[in-house]
C-alpha cells in the first residue's frame, strides 16, 4: 500500500520477511509417545524425532495453516517397556511428515458429531 | 545401553537424530500483534515475523525447554491504526529473539500473580 512513500529496498526486505513466514512444512520436533498415543509404560529412546509439520502465517487471520498431504517417515528407535523384562528393542516407528500445506477456513460445525472408524 | 547388540552406524543415526531434537533456539513464526499485546485497532503488515524461540526436547519429562538469554531484534513493519487517519507508518518493532536455551524444572506456581510493568 505504501509503494510511493518508501524506498524499494525497504519494501523488498519487508516482503521477503512476509514470504518466509508463509504457511509451509517446517522442521519440527515431536514427542513420539504422545504422537502415537502409547500407554504410559511404553517409552522411546530418543523420545523425540524431527519431522516436517505445517506452520506459519496465512493471508487472513481466520484461516489455519493445515496439512493437505502427508507421508510417513520410518524412524529407528528403541522401544522400552516398563518393567524392563527384556533388552530394549530397536523398532521402526512411522511418524507423520507433512509434505503439503494450505491455509484453510474452518467449516461450520455440524450439530451432530462425525466419528471416523 | 545397546552398543553390544546393534551396529555402530544405526546407533550413530539415532544419536544424530536425538542431538537435533535437543532444546535449542529454533526459527519460529510469531504474530506481532499478539506478541506485543496490542489493542485491536493497531495492526501490522506483515502480521508475522521470523525469530528464534526455544524449542525441542529435554532428557526428562519433568523439564521444560526455556530461554536463558534473549536479544531483541528490530523488524521494520508497517503499523496501521484504525480508523486510518494517516499513511501507514514504517516503524521499527522490537521482537524477542531467544539466544540461549536450557532444560529447566517447572517452577511451582505462586499463589499470586506477577505483573511486569
Amino acid at each position: 500500500f505504501a509503494a510511493t512513500f518508501y524506498d524499494i529496498e525497504t519494501l523488498k526486505v519487508i516482503d521477503e520477511e512476509w514470504q518466509r513466514t508463509q504457511c509451509s512444512p517446517r522442521e519440527t520436533c515431536v514427542e513420539v509417545a504422545s504422537e502415537l498415543g502409547k500407554s504410559t509404560n511404553t517409552f522411546f529412546k530418543p523420545p523425540c524425532v524431527n519431522v516436517f509439520r505445517c506452520g506459519g502465517c496465512c493471508n487472513e487471520e481466520s484461516l489455519i495453516c493445515m496439512n493437505t498431504s502427508t507421508s510417513y517417515i520410518s524412524k529407528q528407535l528403541f522401544e522400552i517397556s516398563v518393567p524392563l523384562t527384556s533388552v530394549p528393542e530397536l523398532v521402526p516407528v512411522k511418524v507423520a511428515n507433512h509434505t503439503g500445506c494450505k491455509c484453510l477456513p474452518t467449516a461450520p460445525r455440524h450439530p451432530y458429531s462425525i466419528i471416523r472408524r | 545401553f545397546a552398543a553390544t547388540f546393534y551396529d555402530i552406524e544405526t546407533l550413530k543415526v539415532i544419536d544424530e537424530e536425538w542431538q537435533r531434537t535437543q532444546c535449542s533456539p529454533r526459527e519460529t513464526c510469531v504474530e506481532v500483534a499478539s506478541e506485543l499485546g496490542k489493542s485491536t485497532n493497531t495492526f501490522f503488515k506483515p502480521p508475522c515475523v521470523n525469530v528464534f524461540r526455544c524449542g525441542g526436547c529435554c532428557n526428562e519429562e519433568s523439564l521444560i525447554c526455556m530461554n536463558t538469554s534473549t536479544s531483541y531484534i528490530s523488524k521494520q513493519l508497517f503499523e496501521i491504526s484504525v480508523p486510518l487517519t494517516s499513511v501507514p507508518e514504517l516503524v521499527p518493532v522490537k521482537v524477542a529473539n531467544h539466544t540461549g536455551c536450557k532444560c529447566l524444572p517447572t517452577a511451582p506456581r505462586h499463589p499470586y500473580s506477577i505483573i511486569r510493568r
Epitope: Q22, C103 | F43
Partner: antibody, heavy 118, light 112 residues
Framework: QVQLVQSGAEVKQPGASVKVSCKAS????????MYWVRQAPGQGLEWMGY????????TYNQKFKGRVTMTTGTSTSTAYMKLRSLRSDDTAVYYC???????????WGRGTLVTVAS | DIVMTQTPLSSPVTLGQPASISCRSS???????????LHWLQQRPGQPPRLLIY???NRFSGVPDRFSGSGAGTDFTLKISRVEAEDVGVYYC?????????FGQGTKLEIK
C-alpha cells in the same frame, strides 16, 4: 492508494464461458487473498470463492465448484475469474474484493456486468 | 452453510434520527482463535459495496463515527446514531469465520 480495476461488461450466450479480470495496484499483490462476489440484478451478494495469489491456492463455494476457476498473474498483479457453462441466472455484476488480514473485504472493484442471453 | 438473517429488510428513517439493523447467524461466529469475524458493508445505489465495520465493532478507515457495531455469538447490531442523506443504500452483514463466506439478505435504508 489501493485500486482494483475490473474488465468491461460482457454479453454471453447460454453454455459459453466468461473470464473477468481484476488488476490490483497500490499494495503487495501476493500478501492478500482476492475474493470474488457476484450480485444478480436487484439481489443480494453471493460469495463465489477466493484465491491466494502467493501460491495459487483456491477455495470455492461448493455451489460453483466445477464451473468456476480462479487464477492470478503475479507479474501483472491481476486476478482472473472464469465461469463456464453459463446460464441465464448467471446474469450478474461480478466483483473482485481484497480480503483484509483482520477480516472483511476492505477494497472492492467497481464490478463487471455479465449478461447471459440468447 | 451459515445463514445470516437481517431485520428489518426495509427501514424508513427521518434525517438526524438513529437507525438500527439486526443480524442473526444460524451458528456461532466465534472462531477457534477467539475472534468473531462478523462485518458490515454499505452499498449505495449504483456503487460497489464498501466495508464499514469489521470484526463486530471496528470501524474501517474513513467511516464516520456515527456508525457503530456490537454483538456477540449469533446476534449482532449495526447502529447509526444520526442518519444523514448520504447513508441511503443497502446494508449487509457478512461472516468470514466459516466457509462458504455468507451475507445477510440486505437491509434497505431510506429517508422518510
Amino acid at each position: 492508494q489501493v485500486q482494483l480495476v475490473q474488465s468491461g461488461a460482457e454479453v454471453k450466450q447460454p453454455g459459453a464461458s466468461v473470464k473477468v479480470s481484476c488488476k490490483a495496484s497500490g499494495y503487495t499483490f501476493t500478501g492478500y487473498n482476492m475474493y470474488w462476489v457476484r450480485q444478480a440484478p436487484g439481489q443480494g451478494l453471493e460469495w463465489m470463492g477466493y484465491i491466494d495469489p502467493y501460491n495459487g491456492d483456491t477455495t470455492y463455494n461448493q455451489k460453483f465448484k466445477g464451473r468456476v476457476t480462479m487464477t492470478t498473474g503475479t507479474s501483472t498483479s491481476t486476478a482472473y475469474m472464469k465461469l463456464r457453462s453459463l446460464r441465464s441466472d448467471d446474469t450478474a455484476v461480478y466483483y473482485c474484493a481484497r480480503a483484509s488480514y483482520y477480516g472483511g473485504m476492505d477494497y472492492w472493484g467497481r464490478g463487471t456486468l455479465v449478461t447471459v442471453a440468447s | 452453510d451459515i445463514v445470516m438473517t437481517q431485520t428489518p429488510l426495509s427501514s424508513p428513517v427521518t434525517l438526524g434520527q438513529p437507525a438500527s439493523i439486526s443480524c442473526r447467524s444460524s451458528q456461532s461466529l466465534v472462531h477457534s482463535n477467539g475472534n468473531t469475524y462478523l462485518h458490515w458493508l454499505q452499498q449505495r445505489p449504483g456503487q460497489p459495496p464498501r466495508l464499514l465495520i469489521y470484526k463486530v465493532s471496528n470501524r474501517f478507515s474513513g467511516v464516520p463515527d456515527r456508525f457503530s457495531g456490537s454483538g456477540a455469538g449469533t446476534d449482532f447490531t449495526l447502529k447509526i446514531s444520526r442518519v444523514e442523506a448520504e447513508d441511503v443504500g443497502v446494508y449487509y452483514c457478512s461472516q468470514s469465520t466459516h466457509v462458504p463466506r455468507t451475507f445477510g439478505q440486505g437491509t434497505k435504508l431510506e429517508i422518510k
